[in-house]
């Protein structure tokens, strides 16, 4: 699986999940999130060669097409597969609110 | 929606579905498919600016991150959203077989 367990431990050129730390205030300009100050959102990147974690028949066909026609511009792309939520603390006036934001952290990638 | 109705009628630089005709024999080296000789598989491409057909909260966050930090390499990718099947005819010996291959034709795209 192209997940954090594998990808963070190996120098992998092809499609894999990569670490990306986002500081809410500095990187997004968000002051409203009180805690945490930032988090590992991560992201997916890297080429998608033939049959690498192919998501659909189309991505397999496109991977084969790209392999046999390397001059072509059409190829599958490395995108998130499994995502996890992030719990944040923010304030409405002086009232603290805890919210779980869904699909905030990339745990694995696929070729789509 | 970033679908064929919109994308094929407009010169759109950002994420959109693009026409791609694949000839089974010439492009994939597949002799086994008797009919059709080829089909419009289509593909997705183009940049994913902030909020363009964002798939998840993560892709929205990443789009904002990329907008505010344009030197960053992390950005959402334009990938298939809706796919349709393709019906093919092939032979096993002299016996004709009809098969519906799922997820073969891209009809619309999203930023993931």
């Amino acid at each position: 699986a192209l997940d954090t367990n594998y990808c963070f431990r190996n120098l992998e050129e092809n499609c894999c999940v990569r670490p990306l730390y986002i500081d809410f205030r500095q990187d997004l300009g968000w002051k409203w999130v009180h805690e945490p100050k930032g988090y590992y959102a991560n992201f997916c990147s890297g080429p998608c060669p033939y049959l690498r974690s192919a998501d659909t028949t189309h991505s397999t066909v496109l991977g084969l097409y790209n392999t046999l026609n390397p001059e072509a511009s059409a190829s599958p792309c490395c995108v998130p597969q499994d995502l996890e939520p992030l719990t944040i603390l923010y304030y409405v006036g002086r009232t603290p609110k805890v919210e779980q934001l869904s699909n905030m952290v990339v745990k694995s990638c696929k070729c789509s | 929606a970033l679908d064929t109705n919109y994308c094929f009628r407009n010169l759109e630089e950002n994420c959109c579905v693009r026409p791609l005709y694949i000839d089974f024999r010439q492009d994939l080296g597949w002799k086994w498919v008797h009919e059709p000789k080829g089909y419009y598989a289509n593909f997705c491409s183009g940049p994913c600016p902030y909020l363009r057909s964002a798939d998840t909260t993560h892709s929205t966050v990443l789009g904002l991150y990329n907008t505010l930090n344009p030197e960053a390499s992390a950005s959402p990718c334009c990938v298939p959203q809706d796919l349709e099947p393709l019906t093919i005819l092939y032979y096993v010996g002299r016996t004709p077989k009809v098969e519906q291959l799922s997820n073969m034709v891209v009809k619309s795209c999203k930023c993931s």
């Epitope: 049959l51 192919a54 028949t57 397999t60 084969l64 046999l68 | 024999r25 994939l28 080296g29 597949w30 002799k31 086994w32 092939y90 096993v92 098969e99 291959l101």
Partner: nanobody, 114 residues
């Protein structure tokens, strides 16, 4: 039930040759795109060579000119002739068939060592 059975792996010295075989059963072999992948320790599987049913072939840059993929539809077998083997060719080699979906063999170990 589909089966892909690899054979022909072993221990060789640099510069020597090996021929891998993959016998297929339970699929329409003549229609399948056949491929050899390899996986070195701590690495993902990578495509080594593929051959379509129309005999289109493709090779990884690292093996071009040294490896040759071929198929025998009468015998339902795909071969990988490997020459001028190098240390970096050491890996488990997997046979793959794609026909409507992907199928994998169990793998055969190739070790290049002096």
């Amino acid at each position: 039930q589909l089966q892909l059975v690899e054979s022909g792996g072993g221990l060789v010295q640099p510069g020597e040759s090996l021929r891998l075989s993959c016998a297929a059963s339970g699929i329409i072999f003549s229609a399948s795109t056949m491929a050899w992948f390899r996986q070195a320790p701590g690495k993902q599987r990578e495509l080594v060579a593929l051959i379509t049913d129309g005999d289109r072939t493709n090779y990884a840059d690292s093996v071009k000119g040294r490896f040759t993929i071929s198929r025998d539809n009468a015998e339902n077998t795909v071969y990988l002739q490997m020459t001028e083997l190098k240390f970096e060719d050491t890996a488990v080699y997997y046979c793959n068939a794609f026909w409507l979906k992907a199928y994998w063999g169990q793998g055969t170990q190739v070790t290049v060592s002096s």
